[in-house]
């Protein structure tokens, strides 16, 4: 198949990587079929330099990532190792809360306003970061 | 200046499959996602599934999964539609559609048509 | 699914009129949505997108609002070629679904 070589219009590249920035809001399981969508996956945060590029262009907004633990495990997207990776969780977090009265616990993350994780509820409305890497061929097994 | 053809349609029994094919030009067709959406004679607007730019990823209605399988070839431009196990209930005019991508980046589906192609299933 | 309403199912109406048209969502869809113009033996046309952002060159006569659940689709001063079927879709999650549709017809 194809590889992407470039960044599509309005994605800011980044080592080797396309980032879109949401400016509005989606549950967790919609944000992460809009990226899909577009060929891509919620962002997946590997390094701290990551973890800072990200957190600059999102800003102090509370914005889903393509980390959640739904079916047990935490776990990335796009199959990152969770438990050898790297995590910037909040103190105290995840905490998988059932204070909140939605029903259930909290079983994706997203970057607070400070820029570390919390998990969440999954249907909450927040902002997202689709990610796709370059130099990655395009016809690739279908994620779903 | 954007122009999608559907064809393949006609009259199939029920059970049996049809396959229906959308060319497109005046787009680069690669960069968008693209759907179906079909109308029974006289009803409203029912949307049947997506698929993205490179074909990784596709979305279906309930109605049809297992049963329609929506493909495209890039190097063609061309957008498919296999239809098995069909039913009277899929008798409609099916329509090829792209989206549009605002000055975000944001991509909204469903921004431009085609003329449609009417599938009849009858014994 | 998230369920789609519109509301009047259809309307008679004369030129020069307002009209509106209501569709409500059976869950909170963001500005998830747009508005079609359809006319007999014809492909739907975007006139709305984004609940409120008017499609590149349709009269500025067509105006959309609202947000959440409940939106609007308003003609100004209606027009001959306005007559025609108007349907909601909802772009906030799979399955996409689309409104019932109303029908607007010469009074």
């Known amino acids: 198949g194809s590889e992407r070589t470039c960044c599509p219009v309005n994605w800011v590249e980044h080592e080797r990587s396309c980032y879109w920035f949401s400016r509005s809001g989606k549950a967790w399981a919609d944000a992460d079929n809009y990226c899909r969508l577009e060929d891509a996956h919620l962002v997946v945060v590997t390094s701290w330099e990551e973890q800072k590029f990200v957190q600059h262009h999102i800003g102090p907004v509370n914005t889903w990532m393509g980390l959640h633990d739904q079916n047990g495990p935490w776990k990335w997207v796009d199959g990152t190792d969770y438990e050898t990776g790297f995590k910037n969780w909040r103190p105290e977090q995840p905490d998988d809360w059932y204070g909140h009265g939605l029903g259930g616990g909290e079983d994706c993350a997203h970057f607070t306003d400070d820029g570390r994780w919390n998990d969440d509820v999954c249907q909450r409305p927040y902002r997202w970061v689709c990610e796709t890497e370059l130099d990655k061929a395009s016809q690739e097994p279908p994620l779903l | 200046e954007v122009q999608l053809l559907e064809s393949g349609g006609g009259l199939v029994q029920p059970g049996g499959s049809r396959r229906l094919s959308c060319e497109a030009s005046g787009f680069t067709f690669s960069s968008y996602a693209m759907s179906w959406v079909r109308q029974a004679p006289g009803k409203g607007l029912e949307w049947v599934s997506v698929i993205s730019g490179s074909g990784s990823n596709t979305y279906y209605v309930d109605s049809v999964k297992g049963r329609f399988t929506i493909s495209r070839d890039n190097s063609k431009n061309t957008l498919n539609l296999q239809m098995n196990s069909l039913r009277a209930e899929d008798s409609a005019v099916y329509y090829c559609t792209k989206g549009y991508y605002d000055s975000s980046g944001y991509y909204y589906p469903f921004d431009f048509w085609g003329q449609g192609t009417l599938v009849t299933v009858s014994s | 699914d998230i369920q789609m309403t519109q509301s009047p199912s259809s309307l008679s109406a004369s030129v020069g009129d307002r009209v509106t048209i209501t569709c409500r969502a059976s869950q909170d869809i963001s500005n998830d949505l747009g508005w079609y113009q359809q006319k007999p033996g014809k492909a739907p046309k975007r006139l709305i997108y984004?609940?409120?952002s008017l499609q590149s060159g349709v009269p500025s006569r067509f105006s959309g609002s609202g947000s959440g659940t409940e939106f609007t689709l308003t003609i100004n001063s209606l027009q001959p070629e306005d007559f025609a079927t108007y349907y909601c879709?909802?772009?906030?999650?799979?399955?996409?679904?689309f409104g019932p549709g109303t029908k607007v017809d010469i009074k």
């Open positions: 879709l909802q772009l906030n999650s799979y399955p996409f679904t």
């Open positions: 984004a609940a409120s």
